[in-house]
Interface confidence: medium
């Protein structure tokens, strides 16, 4: 029986050129997390495997940074980044838990907002 629940950052509005953090947390289960996949619609952004660590999809490696934790940082946002993002927790023995985040990227009228921040 799957007893876990996923809490997420929820719906986010951001400006073009900025950066956002996507975070999920799986609670209320003792299942072991073996891997977390981050997907945008049907596109794989990144994988965090318990044994192998992080893998960022080549098409996103310039704009996606792992962390904090099992979360994901998206940088240099474009309007095309608008849409649904999913954190998919692969666990044993429960199976798969999925959390959903909706991101809306808005046109920015302030050019200097494009600065990045660093995830240690």
């Amino acid at each position: 029986m799957m007893t876990g629940t996923i809490e997420t950052t929820g719906n986010i509005s951001a400006e073009k050129g900025g950066s956002i953090i996507l975070q999920c947390h799986l609670s209320s289960t003792t299942a072991q997390v073996t891997q977390v996949n981050w997907e945008q619609q049907d596109q794989l952004l990144a994988i965090c495997n318990a044994d192998l660590g992080w893998h960022i999809s080549p098409s996103f490696k310039d704009r996606v940074a792992p962390g904090p934790g099992l979360g994901l940082t998206l940088q240099s946002l474009t309007v095309n980044d608008t849409g649904e993002y999913f954190c998919i927790y692969h666990t044993y023995p429960d199976g798969t838990y999925t959390g959903r985040i909706f991101l809306e990227v808005l046109e920015s009228s302030v050019a200097e907002h494009g600065a990045r921040f660093q995830i240690p």
């Epitope: 809490e7 997420t8 950052t9 929820g10 986010i12 509005s13 951001a14 400006e15 900025g18 950066s19 956002i20 953090i21 996507l22 975070q23 947390h25 609670s27 907002h113 600065a115 921040f117």
Partner: nanobody, 115 residues
Framework: EVQLVESGGGLVQPGGSLRLSCAAS????????MGWFRQAPGKEREFVAS???????WYADSVKGRFTISADNSKNTAYLQMNSLKPEDTAVYYC?????????WGQGTLVTVSS
């Protein structure tokens, strides 16, 4: 008007403690993600800690076990308790909301760790 105002910074000796506050107005803190970031002179702004609505927290490796993030929904205020401070913690500390690093910044509060 939606606003975040940080306070609680100051000069402290190595090994000392400070508690930073981030007062929010214009939105309900309990319905949002909150985070603390910092920027040292000549460096990029970096993630320090964050907390989700339900209270789950994340920390940068450099502050784990020393810093604690929390939120008091009744006061619409987020906190960063900083213990065992080190000179390398010297920076301007900012809080942010909605997992969005410049969606809303306060003016920051300066923390200086020096003997």
């Amino acid at each position: 008007e939606v606003q975040l105002v940080e306070s609680g910074g100051g000069l402290v000796q190595p090994g000392g403690s400070l508690r930073l506050s981030c007062a929010a107005s214009g939105f309900t803190l309990s319905s949002n993600w909150m985070g603390w970031f910092r920027q040292a002179p000549g460096k990029e702004r970096e993630f320090v800690a964050s907390v989700l609505r339900g209270g789950y927290t994340w920390y940068a490796d450099s502050v784990k076990g020393r810093f604690t993030i929390s939120a008091d929904n009744s006061k619409n205020t987020a906190y960063l308790q900083m213990n065992s401070l080190k000179p390398e913690d010297t920076a301007v500390y900012y809080c942010a909301r909605d997992a969005y690093y410049y969606g809303l910044w306060g003016q920051g509060t300066l923390v200086t760790v020096s003997s």
